[in-house]
């Protein structure tokens, strides 16, 4: 959690911003609230990225005022209007590219303050796993396959049965480019599986950790998927 | 008890469709389980053609793959095999069975012999 | 695919006496899985998960092996045993069967 104060004359006024990961070639939202005002008049919102000479977003007088705004951010930004009054200054971020990580500020100006805080951006892809049995195998065999990563991930097996077991010897990973050639695709095999188990295939780089989940019985098959962002300090 | 009970048309001219049908009663082919279709030769020589899982999925024997489909009714609990082009070398004893995963064949329907004339 | 290959292809022996058919398999497998069939009838599960007799086969029978061998093994051929014994995989894809053993008596 990044908490900012203002500085100068005009009191100063709290502002939070949270950091947070973006996929690339998908939208992402940079965390942005602060103390609200009355007046949606009274406000000013505006988003730097350090480095960038231009601004990234402003939004002021209950309107975006995009004439001083960065190239590289034309038709890509927008805040949640409705909301500014209520004291969410966040930022939508339209196709997110790699080259859009980095310290973003959060500036706002109101009737009782200023105040700003800063957000680290990381741009990266991640997706939802799948685990289901590789019905082209020559052995009981279980397919882990995962989209879209970068930058490259590592991949850890595991079992409910087998706690603590190195799958490494029988598990087979590799990484596909994708068509963009940034991203690419996970597949990861897992030999030897054993009926009336759970195995869990987690894929981790510095931005995400998923996990794709299947309980094999001998009746059934029931799988399950979860993805979490990591280093998502509050600041 | 679980039964798996086959029928079909007993006769088909070669170059035809094929359409046979397992009735299961005992156990829902919703509820788990993978549902497949095995066939035997006049040579004895047993081949497994394919199955539909509980969750709908399928699976085909290779060497079947673009001639047969494998399909469920799941409100009377019946799953069915079809097969494009059959040629007298299709003439067999075609049994449905419940397969566990990676394992066994548990339970067997008796069997409908197809002949197929030309 | 896996190939199972069964030997032998016939057995003819005396009442009483032991059995033993085998069945081998191209690539290395997880459980071998067996059944019986008598004429006019659809197979019976006899041995599954490689050791464990089905319900309703006597304790005579018994099944063993790991890897690419596996066998079946009557203690005492009774003339009720008189069938074809096929082994079969469902671990790799395409499932398949061995071509049987025909159990004879002499």
């Known amino acids: 959690l990044i908490i900012g104060f203002g500085i100068s004359g005009r009191h100063s006024i709290t502002v939070t911003t949270v950091a947070s990961a973006g996929n690339i070639g998908e939208d992402g939202i940079l965390s942005c609230t602060f103390e609200p005002d009355i007046k949606l008049s009274d406000i000013v919102i505006q988003w730097l990225k350090e480095g960038v000479l231009g601004l990234v977003h402003e939004f002021k007088e209950g309107k975006d005022e995009l004439s001083e705004q960065d190239e590289m951010f034309r038709g890509r930004t927008a805040v949640f209007a409705d909301q500014v009054i209520v004291g969410n200054a966040s930022l939508r971020l339209k196709n997110v590219q790699l080259t859009d990580a980095g310290t973003y500020k959060c500036y706002i100006i109101t009737s009782k303050g200023k105040g700003n805080a800063n957000l680290e951006y990381k741009t990266g892809a991640f997706s939802m796993p799948e685990v289901n049995v590789d019905y082209n195998a020559s052995s009981e065999t279980l397919r882990c396959e995962a989209p879209r990563w970068f930058p490259q991930p590592t991949v850890v097996w595991a079992s409910q049965v087998d706690q603590g077991a190195n799958f490494s010897e029988v598990s087979n990973t590799s990484f596909e480019l994708n068509s963009e050639n940034v991203t690419m695709k996970v597949v990861s095999v897992l030999y030897n599986v054993t009926i009336n188990n759970t195995y869990s295939c987690m894929i981790e780089n510095d931005i995400a950790k998923a996990t794709g989940d299947i309980k094999v019985t001998e009746s059934e098959i029931k799988r399950r998927s979860h993805l979490q962002l990591l280093n998502s300090k509050a600041s | 008890d679980v039964l798996l009970q086959e029928s079909g048309p007993g006769l088909v001219k070669a170059s035809q469709s094929l359409s046979l049908t397992c009735s299961v009663t005992?156990?829902?082919?919703?509820?788990?389980?993978?549902w497949n279709w095995i066939r035997q030769f006049p040579g004895n020589k047993l081949e497994w053609m394919g199955y539909i899982s509980y969750d709908g999925g399928n699976s085909y024997n290779p060497s079947l793959k673009n001639r047969i489909s494998i399909t469920r009714d799941t409100s009377k609990n019946q799953f069915f095999l079809r097969m494009k082009s059959v040629t007298a070398e299709d003439t067999a004893t075609y049994y449905c069975?419940?397969?566990?995963?990676?394992?066994?064949?548990?339970?067997w329907g008796q069997g409908t012999t197809l002949t197929v004339s030309s | 695919e896996i190939v199972l290959t069964q030997s032998p292809a016939i057995m003819s022996v005396y009442l009483g006496e032991k059995v033993t058919m085998t069945c081998s398999a191209s690539l290395s497998v997880s459980y071998m899985h067996w059944y019986q069939q008598k004429s006019s009838t659809s197979p019976k599960l006899w041995i599954y998960d490689t050791s464990k007799v089905a319900s309703g086969v006597p304790g005579r029978f018994s099944g063993s092996g790991s890897g690419n061998s596996y066998s079946l093994t009557i203690s005492s051929m009774e003339a009720e045993d008189v069938a074809t014994y096929y082994c079969?995989?469902?671990?790799?894809?395409?499932?398949?069967f061995g071509s049987g053993t025909k159990l004879e008596i002499k």
């Open positions: 069975a419940r397969k566990a995963l990676w394992l066994r064949f548990d339970y």
């Open positions: 005992g156990y829902s082919i919703t509820s788990g389980y993978f």
């Open positions: 079969f995989q469902g671990s790799g894809y395409p499932f398949t």
